[in-house]
């Protein structure tokens, strides 16, 4: 008789990443009988919600339902109907909503309430929407990449199933860059974590991990740019800001009210004699780099060593996966190759920033001007943050791996979040089981 395929015994989970600049929905899938195995969960879909981050809906909360519709409908299509009711849905909001909450808990609650009501209308098992902490964001990002890289598996392999694998159980550090915050998370080498707020203890698959993490709120690429503009306009002699972080010939008008809308620019706030100013690009990497460095206060450190702004940072240890905007920006600039040295990256950034805006627009005709205009700043910011902020060097640069996906799953906090909430990362190593039931009869 012919072998007949039995229905797949699989489970699904949905996580929405409500970031500062946009929301993404991720669908994960795993074999039901292998829930506790490491590396079995994988991403089957990513749907990017059209529009800005949810924190921008303060004045139009009635539009949140429509905003989420396309991606939630996509989830309905991808996940078999029979599985809908048992598929958990989680929404985690990150730094954009942390900033909104800092301004007003009422406004943040209102946005989350409407999001919850909208998501409850779908046939899935909605588990709630919440603002995750920066510590969680860092920790879950670290769990995600190490889970996908097979670092929690106790089985030693003679073959490599994933890129970047050094075939040892040394975990990778995680470097995450968003629009409003950036996270650094890694296991330091025999180093006491001097600041309790930065220390995490995990027991995963029978092994203990002492993890360092910190989330720098306001140091995501978009908020860092707002900070830089607010700092630089303080010393401008008139309403023209000649900015080295934008291409020569680039011009843009900025409203002062928009500049001071975010808590991130509070320290630079002053009464200006104009309501608007014009950015005029001059495209100079070195000057841009110098201006960015002024955002990092390195003069004060109450610990044995710090990153910046008095935040403890142990000596860097091992390899790091740099993902989210670290990857997107470097990918656009064609700088993600393992073979590209830090000196070469700097050289390429100098050339890129110096290119006239008209030339850039022609070369990248398919890219939205809003995003295109900011790659010089973002690339320079990434270099400044990694080198001066986190103290990577030309030598240790080779330990940074710019990662978009691992085994088809996006690097980011969402997978780690779901694994944790669905109790799929056991503290102890699961007992090895016999061969799983055959899916064929």
């Amino acid at each position: 008789t012919q072998n007949k395929a039995l229905p797949e015994n699989v489970k699904y989970g949905i996580v929405l990443d409500a970031g500062s600049s946009h929301t993404s929905l991720y669908i994960y899938k795993w074999p039901a009988e292998k829930e506790n195995d490491t590396g079995v969960v994988h991403q089957v879909e990513e749907c990017r919600v059209k529009g800005p981050g949810i924190s921008k809906f303060v004045q139009k909360v009635n539009e949140i339902g429509i905003y989420l519709t396309d991606c939630m409908e996509r989830a309905r299509e991808v996940i078999p109907r029979s599985q809908h009711q048992e598929t958990p849905v989680y929404l985690g909001a990150t730094a954009g909503m942390r900033l909104l909450r800092m301004e007003s808990e009422e406004l943040a609650d209102r946005v989350l309430d409407v999001v919850e009501r909208s998501l409850s209308n779908y046939p899935f098992d909605f588990q709630g929407a919440r603002i995750i902490t920066g510590q969680e964001e860092g920790a879950y990002g670290w769990i995600t990449i190490n889970y996908l890289l097979g670092k929690f598996s106790q089985k030693t392999r003679w073959f490599s199933i994933v890129p970047y694998e050094t075939n040892n159980q040394e975990t990778f550090g995680a470097l995450d860059l968003g629009g409003a915050s950036t996270q650094v998370t890694f296991v330091p080498q025999n180093q006491t974590i001097e600041s309790p707020d930065n220390a995490l203890q995990f027991r995963l698959y029978g092994k203990d991990y002492n993890v360092y993490t910190h989330s720098f709120l306001c140091y995501g690429k978009d908020q860092a740019l707002w900070q830089k503009l607010a700092k630089d306009i303080q010393v401008a002699s008139n309403e023209i800001l000649r900015d080295p972080c934008f291409h020569p010939g680039y011009k843009k008008v900025v409203n002062v009210s928009d500049l001071y809308k975010t808590p991130c620019t509070k320290r630079f706030e002053m009464t200006l004699p104009f309501q608007q100013f014009e950015i005029q690009g001059i495209g100079n990497y070195q000057q841009c780099h110098q201006s960015i460095l002024e955002l990092f206060n390195t003069s004060y450190c109450p610990y044995s060593q710090c990153a910046f702004n008095g935040i403890f940072l142990p000596p860097l240890q091992g390899d790091f996966g740099a993902f989210s905007a670290f990857y997107f920006v470097m990918k656009f600039l064609n700088l993600t190759s393992e073979k590209v040295s830090q000196e070469k990256v700097t050289e390429m950034m100098k050339k890129f920033c110096a290119q006239p805006w008209e030339e850039i627009k022609t070369s990248y005709a398919g890219v939205k001007e809003k995003y295109l205009s900011e790659y010089c700043f973002s690339g320079t910011y990434i270099l400044s943050l990694l080198l001066q902020g986190y103290h990577f060097t030309a030598d240790s640069w080779e330990h940074i791996h710019f990662i978009g996906k691992i085994q088809g799953s996006d690097a980011g906090w969402t997978l780690g979040y779901m694994l944790n909430l669905t109790n799929m990362i056991p503290a102890e190593q699961p007992l090895s089981t016999p061969l799983s039931h055959s899916t064929y009869v």
């Epitope: 942390r98 800092m102 009422e106 902490t133 920066g134 510590q135 306001c218 808590p263």
Partner: antibody, heavy 116, light 111 residues
């Protein structure tokens, strides 16, 4: 759980300065603003100003501009309010309160007495 | 500045009876569909305790007998059935705009 613990009572002479501390625990200190509110004996509560612990930016009620300073030590999760050129009418209980727009958590209060 | 006017200044109510306190703002304290209006309870020698936020939402651990209503400029705090432990001074506050301002307080006593 969230806690705000303030420094002890102070007695000051007119013209002097006072610095009150507020140590926070149970949450990420830099995720919320810290406000200062005072209450003179038998009077209504009076908002003085707030700080963004994240970056040290502050905003004051016009009445206290130039005379009050709010600072933070993020490594110690502590906010400070300093009031200079004290006069007898500054005799009050000074409170710190955590919040953006919702003052859900308050310190126990610090009595500052200004007397010659 | 937004001026917050509370009435009455004091109120004596029998145990188990309803107590109603009013607060009027000199201009609307609503923004983005939210009322930035808060009610606090303060007992002697203690810091204020948040009872109601956003005009009508109960603070954490606040008994159900406390409720808030209103929008724009006129707001009400109601204690549906006064208990002995409710004897205190009650303040309204707006945080729509700086400077954040408080009402003059209403002293609630038992008749």
């Amino acid at each position: 759980q969230v806690q705000l613990v303030q420094s002890g009572a102070e007695v000051k002479k007119p013209g002097a300065s006072v610095k009150v501390s507020c140590k926070a625990s149970g949450y990420t200190f830099t995720d919320y603003n810290m406000h200062w509110v005072r209450q003179a004996p038998g009077q209504r509560l009076e908002w003085m100003g707030y700080i963004v612990p994240l970056n040290g930016g502050s905003t004051f009620s016009q009445k206290f501009k130039g005379r009050a300073t709010i600072t933070v030590d993020t490594s110690a999760s502590t906010a400070y309010m300093e009031l200079s050129s004290l006069r007898s009418e500054d005799t009050a209980v000074y409170y710190c309160a955590r919040g953006g727009t919702r003052f859900a958590y308050w310190g126990q209060g610090t009595l500052v007495t200004v007397s010659s | 500045d937004i001026v917050m006017t509370q009435s009455p200044d004091s109120l004596a109510v029998s145990l188990g009876e309803r107590a109603t306190i009013n607060c009027r703002a000199s201009e609307s304290v609503d923004n983005f569909g939210v009322s930035f209006m808060y009610w606090f309870q303060q007992k002697p020698g203690q810091p204020p305790k948040l009872l109601i936020y956003g005009a009508s939402n109960q603070g954490s651990g606040v008994p159900d007998r406390f409720s808030g209503s209103g929008s724009g400029t006129d707001f009400t705090l109601t204690i549906s059935s006064l208990q002995a432990e409710d004897v205190a001074v009650y303040y309204c506050q707006q945080t729509k705009e700086v400077p954040y301002t408080f009402g003059g307080g209403t002293k609630v006593e038992i008749k």
